[in-house]
Amino acid sequence: ARSEDRYRNPKGSACSRIWQSPRFIARKRGFTVKMHCYMNSASGNVSWLWKQEMDENPQQLKLEKGRMEESQNESLATLTIQGIRFEDNGIYFCQQKCNNTSEVYQGCGTELRVMGFSTLAQLKQRNTLKD
Amino acid sequence: LWMHKVPASLMVSLGEDAHFQCPHNSSNNANVTWWRVLHGNYTWPPEFLGPGEDPNGTLIIQNVNKSHGGIYVCRVQEGNESYQQSCGTYLRVRQPPPRPFLDMGEGTKNR
């Protein structure tokens, strides 16, 4: 397995642990969601990654100005996404680069599922069922 | 001891079986146990479900219903070492769409 597909809870470096919550969020389109990470903030900076599918490699999250915001209050880092859309679906990871060792540690990830009807076809299918 | 990443969620239709894997790099004598955390309930310890089956420590839940929803976490322990815990997989139980009351073809419907 690739190194990014595995993790452990090392006893070593101070930033070897990063906790992420929640594991899963399902919200309707247009809602606001927040995900959180708790870590030793003195050890290094936190960034956010995103991937659409389980088997993909996470990419650096491009923060959409005015809609996505990252904040940090000491050990607690938060990613806020307002007005969620279907293209926000995926798994979000917080990541910390250790200052002293340049090692990288990731949280477990938060999966976001945006609910609702994404296509006209889905909407028609539902109306057919209702009829 | 390495734990490999597991899916963040698993969707299973009502009445089907749910299969959870606990991939790790441990030797055969590792002890794999399964635990469930109710989503949004942060009490600890989580509910103990039992040991895993086969070398992968698989957990199978048969005939899934709504009450099975939650986050399923496996723990792997080698000897007296402290355990390693998976990130957990959130089980989503899907209600199949209801069959129409009059289960008839479109042609019949439009007569």
Epitope: N9, R17, W19, S21, P22, K34, H36, Y38, N73, E74, S75, L76, T78 | V37, G40, N41, Y42, T43, W44, P45, P46, V73, Q85
Partner: nanobody, 116 residues
Framework: DVQLQESGGGLVQPGGSLSLTCTAS????????RAWHRQAPGKQRELVAA???????MYADSVKGRFTISRDNAKTTVSLQMDSLKPEDTAVYYC??????????WGQGTQVTVSS
């Protein structure tokens, strides 16, 4: 409003022990992380130890093997057992509680002084 009540600080000789306790006026169902931070004079506040709802722990490198964090879920308390104390452990120790929705609460702080 959520109140955090700390106790157990004081003056201790190098090599000695102290136990800090913090009780939160909040349901244990709504706690994700309980932690202790400390602030030495002229320095930034730093994480000492934390325990999450899965029972996992994290420690600052400087206290590993000497400090132990634990909790009593029924009483919503978090404790920090500090052994083999050193003069550099002298600081104000703050209790910190985080809920699953990211709300963070802090105690008033308790002074720990390690000196001969």
């Amino acid at each position: 409003d959520v109140q955090l009540q700390e106790s157990g600080g004081g003056l201790v000789q190098p090599g000695g022990s102290l136990s800090l306790t913090c009780t939160a006026s909040i349901s244990s169902l709504t706690i994700w992380v309980r932690a202790w931070h400390r602030q030495a004079p002229g320095k930034q506040r730093e994480l000492v130890a934390a325990i999450n709802s899965d029972g996992q722990t994290m420690y600052a490198d400087s206290v590993k093997g000497r400090f132990t964090i634990s909790r009593d879920n029924a009483k919503t308390t978090v404790s920090l057992q500090m052994d083999s104390l050193k003069p550099e452990d002298t600081a104000v120790y703050y209790c910190n509680v985080v809920t699953p929705n990211g709300q963070q609460y802090w105690g008033q702080g308790t002074q720990v002084t390690v000196s001969s």
